[in-house]
């Protein structure tokens, strides 16, 4: 006869490990007892259990409550046992010693591998600002046994670097993602992907990128100067900019206070029916936590009568 076992038994932390030991004997052969021991404990073998054909399973005090026989139906030639709720410390070498009649004794050895799935964590780097050089966007750490694989999934252009720390029974892997911040990256997902044999599927943690910036400011509304004449209603100036975080707007007049009746509504400056009082230099001040920008325009309110007189003069002058 011969013993059938596995070279390696792999389980995930917390699962039950079946340690196989089956005697494939000739007809009439019997298994008297099967002794299971851990054999890499350093100070000699450590008994797990003794499986006796007459007296059943006797679990060693060191493994009390943790070793069972597989559920029925049971073959009398099967010396396999279940190690319940495998922990990392169970990883190691085990052997079964089988005493048979009349063929004598047999032994087999196997390695129990306990996979410890990682619990990844993602830590964003310092605040990203446009104009910075290569900057840490995020780091992702995962510890497990064996060492997990940590990669990044993103459309953003960047560079990655990884380092690994080995502990007694596990390894921690940290991967960093560096990039040169630009406003186009805003709102883009940066996903840490952790792979491990103890996971049914990859674990993914997504971080949304936020890059602080403030665009140049410009003012719209003066494209057609002829519309800015006395009496015109609904005239307005709009300050154009964009930023992250979203900017706030402030309007001032360079050559004095804002005329009465002029309404400030965020990025928009609304005028009452125009008078010559509204002529002047207006400044839009845009700011966020990152920066501030100014844009100024000159409003020149035209008097239609003066304009027509001038035109006549111009005509007569010609």
């Amino acid at each position: 006869g011969e013993l059938e076992t596995s070279d390696v038994v792999t389980v995930v932390l917390g699962q039950d490990a079946k340690l196989p030991c089956f005697y494939r004997g000739d007809s009439g052969e019997q298994v008297g007892q099967v002794a299971w021991a851990r054999v890499d404990a350093g100070e000699g073998a450590q008994e797990l259990a003794l499986l006796h054909s007459k007296y059943g399973l006797h679990v060693s005090p060191a493994y009390e409550g943790r070793v069972e026989q597989p559920p029925p139906p049971r073959n009398p030639l099967d010396g396999s046992v279940l190690l319940r709720n495998a922990v990392q410390a169970d990883e190691g070498e085990y052997e079964c010693r089988v005493s048979t009649f009349p063929a004598g004794s047999f032994q087999a050895r196997l390695r129990l591998r306990v996979l410890v799935p990682p619990l990844p964590s993602l830590n964003p780097g310092p605040a990203l600002e446009e104009g910075q050089g290569l900057t840490l966007a995020a780091s992702c750490t995962a510890e497990g046994s064996p060492a997990p694989s940590v990669t990044w999934d993103t459309e953003v252009k960047g560079t990655t670097s990884s380092r690994s720390f080995k502990h007694s029974r596990s390894a921690a892997v940290t991967s960093e993602f560096h990039l040169v911040p630009s406003r186009s990256m805003n709102g883009q997902p940066l996903t840490c992907v952790v792979s491990h044999p103890g996971l049914l599927q990859d674990q993914r943690i997504t971080h949304i990128l936020h890059v602080s910036f403030l665009a140049e400011a410009s003012v719209r509304g003066l494209e057609d100067q002829n519309l800015w004449h006395i009496g015109r209603e609904g005239a307005m100036l709009k300050c154009l900019s964009e930023g992250q975080p979203p900017p706030s707007y402030n309007w001032t007049r360079l050559d004095g206070p804002l005329p009465s009746g002029v309404r400030v509504d965020g990025d928009t400056l609304g005028f009452p029916p125009l008078t010559t009082e509204h002529s002047g230099i207006y400044v839009c001040h845009v700011s966020n936590e990152f920066s501030s920008r100014d844009s100024q325009v000159t409003v020149d309110v035209l008097d239609p009568q003066e304009d027509s007189g001038k035109q006549v003069d111009l005509v007569s002058a010609s």
Epitope: G44, L50, H52, R109
Partner: antibody, heavy 120, light 111 residues
Framework: EVQLQQSGPDLVKPGASVKISCKAS????????MHWVKQSHGKSLEWIGR????????SYNQKFKDKAILTVDKSSTTAYMELRSLTSEDSAVYYC?????????????WGQGTLVTVSA | DIVLTQSPASLAVSLGQRATISCRAS??????????MHWYQQKPGQPPKLLIK???NLESGVPARFSGSGSGTDFTLNIHPVEEEDTATYYC?????????FGGGTKLEMK
């Protein structure tokens, strides 16, 4: 310090029973099997059996299956061996013994021995 | 049951010389990991004392003049150099299977 303190010598009549005790101290009582070994005068050693202090489960040498009963009292960290239907063949020194590490093999710690004399 | 046969039954050795005791098992007690054979010393009126475990591993506190070797079915206990206090009976014991058994013993005396 691991100590196994056995009860004193016993003189018993043939056909009677005797119960030997082995008080354990200095270690986790439930973490190790307690073994019992017989040594007849001028003879070698014979392994009688072992008991698991966690649950009282015992394994015997078939030769002693009907002779010895192994029990434990967890509260007093004491192991007992009762010998029944005694004959002169049972006159011997009986030892309790413990393994070096939880579940490992060999007997690193021994009681001082209890002499049982069976005589009419 | 596994039978352990020790030889010689008794042995007289001069101080400082080597004492060699053999133990033969009726079947192999060795795996790829360990040999499940142990050696004990017993002095009159005392319990046995573990000297060597797993064929060759010296038990803590045991003098280095004691050594064990062997595998499979043949095992040896060596004492060198022998000292006066080594006068005792020596036993081998296997823990391959239940029942554990002991050899018949070897009585060591000084010449």
């Amino acid at each position: 310090e691991v100590q196994l303190q056995q009860s004193g010598p016993d003189l018993v009549k043939p056909g009677a029973s005797v119960k030997i005790s082995c008080k354990a101290s200095g270690y986790s009582f439930t973490g190790h099997y307690m073994h019992w070994v017989k040594q007849s005068h001028g003879k070698s050693l014979e392994w009688i059996g072992r008991v698991n202090p966690n649950n009282g489960g015992s394994s015997y040498n078939q030769k002693f299956k009907d002779k010895a009963i192994l029990t434990v009292d967890k509260s007093s960290t004491t192991a007992y061996m009762e010998l029944r239907s005694l004959t002169s063949e049972d006159s011997a020194v009986y030892y309790c013994a413990r393994d070096p590490l939880g579940g490992s093999y060999g007997f690193a710690y021994w009681g001082q021995g209890t002499l049982v004399t069976v005589s009419a | 049951d596994i039978v352990l046969t020790q030889s010689p039954a008794s042995l007289a050795v001069s101080l400082g010389q080597r004492a060699t005791i053999s133990c033969r098992a009726s079947q192999s007690v060795t795996t790829s990991s360990y040999s499940y054979m142990h050696w004990y010393q017993q002095k009159p009126g005392q319990p046995p004392k573990l000297l060597i475990k797993y064929a060759s591993n010296l038990e803590s506190g045991v003098p280095a003049r004691f050594s064990g070797s062997g595998s499979g079915t043949d095992f040896t206990l060596n004492i060198h150099p022998v000292e006066e206090e080594d006068t005792a009976t020596y036993y081998c014991q296997h823990s391959w299977e239940i029942p554990y058994t002991f050899g018949g013993g070897t009585k060591l005396e000084m010449k």
